[in-house]
């Protein structure tokens, strides 16, 4: 009945509704049907959210912050539904809402606790700072404060730096990890306990590849089954790091099954893509192709990063000419 939020039932006519920032929610309230229905919704027992009586809304004294954001299920009132449809919730809307419902038979009051969460999709970034390599897990906007955990080769790491900036309504969080010289795999998990939402970033360094000029190289990129769900929208990006910055070679969008290729020597195997294998080929290698290649598979729930280091060496032919 109430698809826009989930409720936790607690005693004393009190329910908890969990909403997501900027989304619509429903504050539930029901009553025993009767004639002459009066419905008053209030916030923190002080601010008028919505009033309905004598068959229509009376919003003259509605608090301005709720203007054009509330409505009732008017066709359902006679069936005992006094629920409030609440548009575009913000973190300032968190708190206790009281629904007063009166009929000719009885008066009841229901309390609904609204909690609002934010979880803008996090990202895992791989950065080079001078001679150091860093993995950074970051989330631009999150509320309440999330739980961030790191693992190295599936073993939890206690060291966990968190750079936090708080805005008016949410946190922005960066958690960097120095992985200089490491060949281990790393995993970062960000959990929003309120929204019961978890995001995972996984980073894997593949063995270095040595290739000769003019040869081609195949770089593997296959998602880990634990995270990957082909039914969920995701994006695959291949990029190459040159002098500390990545340039995108190609990307694939699962929603449209579109592949965009920015490098003419890059090729993707369509059949492999259909089997969720995003390995790529780079033809006709030249010396400037040496560097780090990053495959990024990202969805709302995970980011899988795979790093390949490619060394292109001059062919014998080229060396003898020199």
């Amino acid at each position: 009945i109430f698809p826009l939020a989930f409720f936790i039932y607690v005693p004393m006519n009190e329910q908890i509704v969990i909403g997501r920032l900027d989304e619509d929610i429903i504050l539930p309230s029901s009553f025993e049907r009767g004639s002459e229905v009066v419905i008053h919704w209030k916030y923190q027992d002080s601010y008028k959210v919505h009033s309905y009586y004598k068959g229509s809304d009376h919003l003259e004294s509605q608090d301005p912050r709720y203007a054009n954001r509330t409505s009732l299920f008017y066709n359902e009132i006679q069936n005992g539904n006094a629920s409030l449809f609440f548009r575009r919730v913000s973190l300032l809307d968190e708190g206790i809402y009281t629904c007063y419902v009166g009929t000719a038979i009885q008066v009841i009051t229901n309390k609904v606790v609204l909690k609002v969460g934010v979880f803008l999709t996090p990202v895992m970034k791989y950065e080079k700072r001078n001679t150091n390599s860093f993995l950074i897990c970051s989330v631009l906007s999150v509320y309440p404060r999330p739980i961030i955990t790191w693992k190295m080769d599936n073993t939890p790491i206690s060291e966990n730096n968190m750079e936090e900036t708080g805005s008016l309504d949410s946190f922005s969080i960066n958690s960097p990890l120095n992985i200089t010289g490491s060949n281990s795999s790393y995993e970062c998990t960000i959990e929003n306990s309120l929204l019961k939402q978890t995001w995972t970033g996984r980073w894997t360094m593949k063995d270095g590849l040595h290739k000769m000029q003019s040869e081609h190289v195949s770089l593997s990129c296959q998602p880990v089954n634990d995270y990957f769900s082909p039914n969920q929208d995701f994006k695959v990006t291949w990029s190459r790091m040159k002098s500390g910055t990545f340039s995108v070679l190609a990307y694939y969008l699962s929603s449209s099954q579109n592949t965009i290729i920015n490098e003419s020597r890059f090729s993707w195997n369509k059949e492999l893509i259909n089997q969720s294998d995003f390995s790529m080929n780079l033809m006709d290698l030249n010396l400037s192709d040496s560097g780090e290649y990053l495959c990024n598979i990202s969805s709302d729930e995970y980011t899988l990063l795979t790093i390949h280091t490619v060394h292109v060496e001059p062919s014998q032919e080229t060396a003898s000419h020199n």
Epitope: S35, E36, H40, D45, K48, Y53, K54, S61, G102, V107
Partner: antibody, heavy 120, light 107 residues
């Protein structure tokens, strides 16, 4: 059962003030709107004022607007009517009455009334 | 403000008679009308609300009808205990005015 007991009536000179109280019991006072209605003995009913269950809305008859103030203390289950600048024509029995539902404005229970006489 | 009038101002009828009292609003008030009965020396009692809904515990010989500006209270078979003054009240918007009353007694 619902009980409403008015007090504070008496004889007062024109221009003076009086405060009526109404002690409520037998129902959840904080859930209901409350009214004051008056009646000159032997005459008809005149609605005076109403206050919502939470005190957030009040309305008055034109004849008392600006002179009378309705209020309530839900923690004490008590309704009040502060009457200032009393006039001879305010002489009446003042009934405290309970709304059937807050926001509908008709009355399902009445107190026994308290007599206010304004006379010089 | 909306004015309420009642007619007749008084009436006498025999036990068992059908009695009709009318209430008129100077402007439309939908069905936001209540009827009260006040017996001599007693406080008023709610009989009908929403123009036609009988308050619980009120005998079924009382009925109400009407909408807009014209309303009727009917006692289908007058009983001795119905001797009283009957008031209509509009509750569509403030002020929640009462009609002047109709006094009913037994011939």
């Amino acid at each position: 059962q619902v009980q409403l007991v008015e007090s504070g009536g008496g004889v007062v000179q024109p221009g003076r003030s009086l405060r009526l109280s109404c002690a409520a019991s037998g129902f959840t006072f904080s859930n209901y709107g409350m009214h004051w209605v008056r009646q000159v003995p032997g005459k008809g009913l005149e609605w005076v004022a109403v206050i919502w269950y939470d005190g957030s809305e009040k309305d008055y008859a034109d004849s008392v607007k600006g002179r009378f103030t309705i209020s309530r203390d839900n923690s004490k289950n008590t309704l009040y009517l502060q009457m200032n600048s009393l006039r001879v024509e305010d002489t009446a029995v003042y009934y405290c009455a309970k709304d059937l539902i807050s926001g509908i404005y008709y009355v399902d229970h009445w107190g026994q009334g308290t007599l206010v006489t304004v006379s010089s | 403000d909306i004015q309420m009038t009642q007619s007749p101002s008084s009436l006498s009828a025999s036990v068992g008679d059908r009695v009709t009292i009318t209430c008129r609003a100077s402007q439309g008030i939908s069905n936001y009308l209540a009827w009260y009965q006040q017996k001599p020396g007693k406080v008023p009692k709610l009989l009908i609300y929403a123009a036609s809904t009988l308050q619980s515990g009120v005998p079924s010989r009382f009925s109400g009808s009407g909408s807009g500006t014209d309303f009727t209270l009917t006692i289908s078979s007058l009983q001795p205990e119905d001797v009283a003054t009957y008031y209509c009240q509009k509750y569509q918007s403030a002020p929640f005015t009462f009609g002047p009353g109709t006094k009913v007694d037994i011939k």
